[in-house]
């Protein structure tokens, strides 16, 4: 509450997160023209990335383009990209939607469709829908430990959200355990009024707000965090503004002296930890 | 403007960026002693990195040291590093400028020069100039979509820079489209009074400032962002303080049961998105 | 000092860091059942990661699990994980402490112990102590250059911590050179009253606070940074809350048509650069 006689100071904050959990992923894998059931286990090293600061990312879905190599190939026949003759293809043209540079030739993509030939990582990425349900939908049961150290330099006061009395096997609950700093990802979504299973398909951004309203006067000292959750990406966003949350990364390797890559389009939840508040003292 | 009767509150912000574009890179490639012209396509997975938070990086230039292996070799003969006898080389010495630990021997680097032998990733990185013009100079035409969600918790008010009415094929322009949040990288530099082609060689840091000056009173409500741009690194910086922006990373692999790496010195532009402002309410 | 007549404004800040140094690492390496002494050199590309923003990480220790592959194997026999019959193992069960999913069978881990068989990255990670002393303990002698650009938009004032008059071969010292922005990592720890050698084993988080108290009135202008250091992680933290600072990442490769990975548990120091302060003007 506002105590107007107090000298207020904004919080200086440092955050450290640790995600726990494993996911079982079952998907169809094609090798040598044969499609079979692939089953794999993903642990933290597979679905999260070494990140700094006030964010962490959990991959919940992905699309792989394996064995790409730099060469010439027909571009992907997305809406408006098909051609019937070379006139439709402009040598040196880079379509921002495409993944390569046109050679000026119109070539067969498959038995029924022709597209402009491009110099690119080939075969070009298929613009297919993210798998539904999400491959790592079980990430809903992962947990994250959040450690938050705060400082009010003007008041020379430091504290943290984890106290020595806390129990490391707790799980945050708004009513029963509001000071526990281990959060089940599914619970975060539930608190924010969002459906994890749905968001996991395309990805999204979730805010974890930590509010410190600190009264540092000795006679009525109080300084504990209050956690709240809200979705930060726009779920109603138009296609052209790239809904959800995804990014592409590549694993490079050499085969028969040719550099190849596997391109991974990773969908997932980016969690932003937003720490704010003030410390007041007479 | 300052309305002194209002209760002001700083903005809580979350940012999401998405870079688009492909670059055609032509460079001399030496294989088996033969130098030929190499041509390759770089897409987002090749020139940017999965990053969190209020920064994104676009690689505009690079120097590669291929096939390095842990062994003994002469260090690079940079200024002051040459030797004529073992006396000049001190066993166990690590020169901060060097990339290895001296063995105490002075050995031939090439036909004319001798340097101290080091235990290092060999052959050691040549300290050559960044290619000029920059290899990915066409990154000037890349675009970045910036999504910014802001919150004034005390006023319980949330908004974002992208409105449902916006057009996903727009490009920001200070006069014609100051609310569009898709920016051409070259335009950002032009607005900041900088030359992209020049900065792309050594790299640099560019600030994209998003200023929210929000009046949250219902009778005169206003809350839209204002974008401005300024260069954050010091272009006049002394050599000793490492001008530009670059970092080294490695790709590791095994060949004939020996661990090898390709070292990449990546030069590029780091874009820092600096969100600030206040929300005022009576 | 507080000048109540002044209009105060919080600082907008951008940070760029550059770490220098090489480490010599000696460790026991087992190949084909034979253990021998391994010796390697780590440079910046090996011990740090391309990071954005106000943090940088220096790896000081690690534990490797080489040649893991997705298959079935006995889980690691940590406290409470051993079994004597299949009844103790539940098909489909994922123990949050374990790294896999149980098949329901109890199988020999070694000659004396049995544990539940799991589908996982195998062999599962051994839960062994971090090496002591830390493998990259010599990181104490690494240096970091910190460049900080600050802006008070309301006062239209910009400056940076590095001035043209500064000497690029300086090292920060609280008394002798308090404006030098090149810091020896060991000195940072000493200033914070911490033991680098000790923290390097398990890792930790160190705060570098840069305080700008700027008087922007022309008649008594002053705007230079003041550096201070404090440890941000809790060194007395209970085991259950994951003391220190570490994360796992993996290097993937193919061998004999099977995807394999080397899992690295990296311990190290995350340095958080916390910039704060105000600019005041009449």
């Amino acid at each position: 509450s506002d105590k107007l006689y107090q000298r207020k100071e904004p919080v200086i904050s440092s955050v450290h997160t640790k995600v726990k959990g494993i996911a079982e992923v079952t998907e169809n894998v094609t090798e040598g023209g044969v499609t079979k059931l692939g089953h794999s286990i993903f642990d933290t090293a597979d679905y999260t990335f070494p990140l700094q600061g006030n964010s962490f990312f959990v991959m919940t879905n992905y699309v792989k383009s394996e064995g790409q190599v730099q060469t010439l190939c027909p571009e992907y026949p997305r809406r408006g990209a098909q051609c019937s003759s070379d006139r439709r293809c402009k040598k040196g043209w880079m379509d921002p939607q495409s993944k390569g540079i046109q050679t000026g030739r119109c070539v067969p993509y498959d038995k029924t469709r022709k597209t402009c030939e491009v110099s690119a990582w080939c075969p070009t990425e298929e613009e297919k829908e993210a798998p539904r349900p999400a491959l790592l939908r079980s990430a809903e049961n992962f947990t994250v430990l959040i450690k938050n150290n705060i400082h009010f330099p003007g008041h020379n006061y430091t504290t943290r959200n984890i106290l020595p009395t806390m129990n490391g096997s707790c799980t945050f609950h708004k009513t029963w355990d509001p000071q526990c700093s281990i959060f089940r990802l599914g619970d975060i979504f539930q608190e924010a009024g969002e459906n994890f299973t749905e968001v996991a398909v395309q990805g999204g951004i979730m805010g974890i707000e930590i509010y410190w309203d600190c009264n540092l006067d000795s006679w009525s000292h109080h300084c504990r965090p209050r956690y709240s959750f809200r979705r930060l990406d726009d779920k109603n966003m138009d296609e052209s503004f790239v809904p959800g949350y995804n990014f592409r990364y590549a694993k490079y390797y050499k085969e028969n002296n040719v550099e190849k890559r596997t391109l991974i389009k990773a969908f997932g939840i980016r969690f932003d930890i937003l720490v704010f508040g003030t410390g007041g003292k007479f | 403007s300052d309305k002194l009767y209002q209760r002001k509150e700083p903005v809580i912000s979350s940012v999401h960026t998405k870079v688009k574009g492909i670059a055609e890179v032509t460079e001399n490639v030496t294989e088996g002693g033969v130098t030929k012209l190499g041509h390759s396509i770089f897409d987002t997975a090749d020139y940017t990195f999965p990053l969190q938070g209020n920064s994104f990086f676009v690689m505009t230039n690079y120097v590669k040291s291929e096939g390095q292996v842990q062994t003994l070799c002469p260090e690079y003969p940079r200024r002051g590093a040459q030797c004529s006898s073992d006396r000049r080389c001190k066993k166990g010495w690590m020169d901060p400028q060097s990339k290895g630990i001296q063995t105490g021997r002075c050995v031939p680097y090439d036909k004319t020069r001798k340097t101290c032998e080091v235990s290092a990733w060999c052959p050691t990185e040549e300290e050559k100039e960044a290619p000029r013009p920059a290899l990915l100079r066409s990154a000037e035409n890349f675009t970045v979509l910036i999504k910014n969600n802001i919150h004034f918790p005390g006023h319980n008010y949330t908004t974002r820079n992208i409105l449902p009415t916006m057009n996903g094929s727009c490009t920001f322009h200070k006069t014609w489209d100051p609310q569009c949040s898709i920016f051409r990288l070259g335009d950002i530099f032009q607005e900041a009074g900088e030359n992209f082609t020049e900065v792309a060689v050594q790299g640099g840091i560019m600030g994209i400032e998003i200023y929210w000056d929000c009046n949250l009173d219902s009778w005169s409500h206003h809350c839209r962002p204002r974008y401005s741009f300024r260069r954050l690194d010091d272009k006049n910086m002394d050599e000793s303080f490492v001008p530009g922006y670059n970092f080294r990373y490695a790709k590791y692999y095994k060949e004939n049961n020996v661990e090898k790496r390709t070292l990449i010195k990546a030069f590029g532009i780091r874009f820092d998105i600096l969100v600030f402002g206040t929300g005022g309410k009576f | 000092s507080d000048k109540l007549y002044q209009r105060k404004e919080p600082v907008i800040s951008s940070v760029h860091t550059k770490v220098k140094g090489i480490a010599e690492v000696t460790e026991n390496v087992t190949e084909g059942g034979v253990t021998k002494l391994g010796h390697s050199i780590f440079d910046t590309a090996d011990y740090t990661f391309p990071l954005q923003g106000n943090s940088f990480f220096v790896m000081t220790n690690y534990v490797k699990s080489e040649g893991q592959v997705q298959t079935l194997c006995p889980e690691y026999p940590r406290r409470g994980a051993q079994c004597s019959s299949d009844r103790r193992c539940k098909k489909g069960w994922m123990d949050p402490q374990s790294k896999g999913i149980q098949t329901g069978r109890c199988v020999p881990y070694d000659k004396t112990r049995k544990t539940c068989e799991v589908s996982a990255w195998c062999p599962t990670e051994e839960e062994k102590e971090a090496p002591r002393p830390a493998l990259l303990r010599s990181a104490e002698n690494f240096t970091v250059l910190i460049k900080n650009n600050i802006h008070f938009p309301g006062h239209n004032y910009t400056t940076r911590n590095i001035l043209p008059t500064m000497n690029g071969s300086c090292t920060f010292h609280k008394t002798w050179d308090p404006q030098c922005s090149i810091f020896r990592l060991g000195d940072i720890f000493q200033e914070a009253g911490e033991n680098f050698t000790e923290v390097a084993v398990q890792g930790g988080i160190m705060g570098i606070e840069i305080y700008w108290d700027c008087n922007l009135d022309s008649w008594s202008h002053h705007c230079r940074p003041r550096y201070s250091f404090r440890r941000l992680d809790d060194k007395n933290m209970d085991e259950s809350f994951v003391p220190g600072y570490n994360f796992r990442y993996a290097k993937y490769y193919k061998e004999n048509n099977v995807e394999k990975r080397t899992l690295i548990k990296a311990f190290g120091i995350r340095f958080d650069i916390l910039v704060f302060g105000t600019g005041g003007k009449f």
Partner: nanobody, 120 residues
Framework: EVQLVESGGGLVQAGGSLRLSCAAS????????MAWYRQAPGKQRELVAD???????NYADSVNGRFTISRDNVRNTVYLQMNGLKPEDTAVYYC??????????????WGQGTQVTVSS
């Protein structure tokens, strides 16, 4: 129906070499650990060598340095290269594989055995 089919056994002189192979056929999800066991007349079946899906190997002391186990994950086949054979290596050699028919449905499978006879 999953089957393990062995081949390569026979009669050989002491000091000679043989190469056993064993292929898994049928419909299954994944071949995990594979191994070779042997049983000499009047004795218990004993482990000769095993190999994980990640190519980690383990040998009985009596064959270490003489025998080499390897596998081909494309063909789901395990091999045993036996050099410097001794009369005491005479036995019926059995192939073993731990195979998942479906996800988390592992079973142990054995081959029918192949005779190796080392004459002095």
């Amino acid at each position: 129906e999953v089957q393990l089919v062995e081949s390569g056994g026979g009669l050989v002189q002491a000091g000679g070499s043989l190469r056993l192979s064993c292929a898994a056929s049928g419909s299954f999800f994944r071949v995990n650990n594979m191994a070779w066991y042997r049983q000499a007349p009047g004795k218990q079946r004993e482990l000769v060598a095993d190999i994980t899906r990640g190519d980690r190997t383990n040998y009985a002391d009596s064959v270490n340095g003489r025998f080499t186990i390897s596998r081909d994950n494309v063909r789901n086949t395990v091999y045993l290269q036996m050099n410097g054979l001794k009369p005491e290596d005479t036995a019926v050699y059995y192939c073993y594989a731990r195979i998942e028919l479906g996800v988390l449905e592992p079973r142990d499978y054995w081959g029918q055995g192949t005779q190796v006879t080392v004459s002095s």
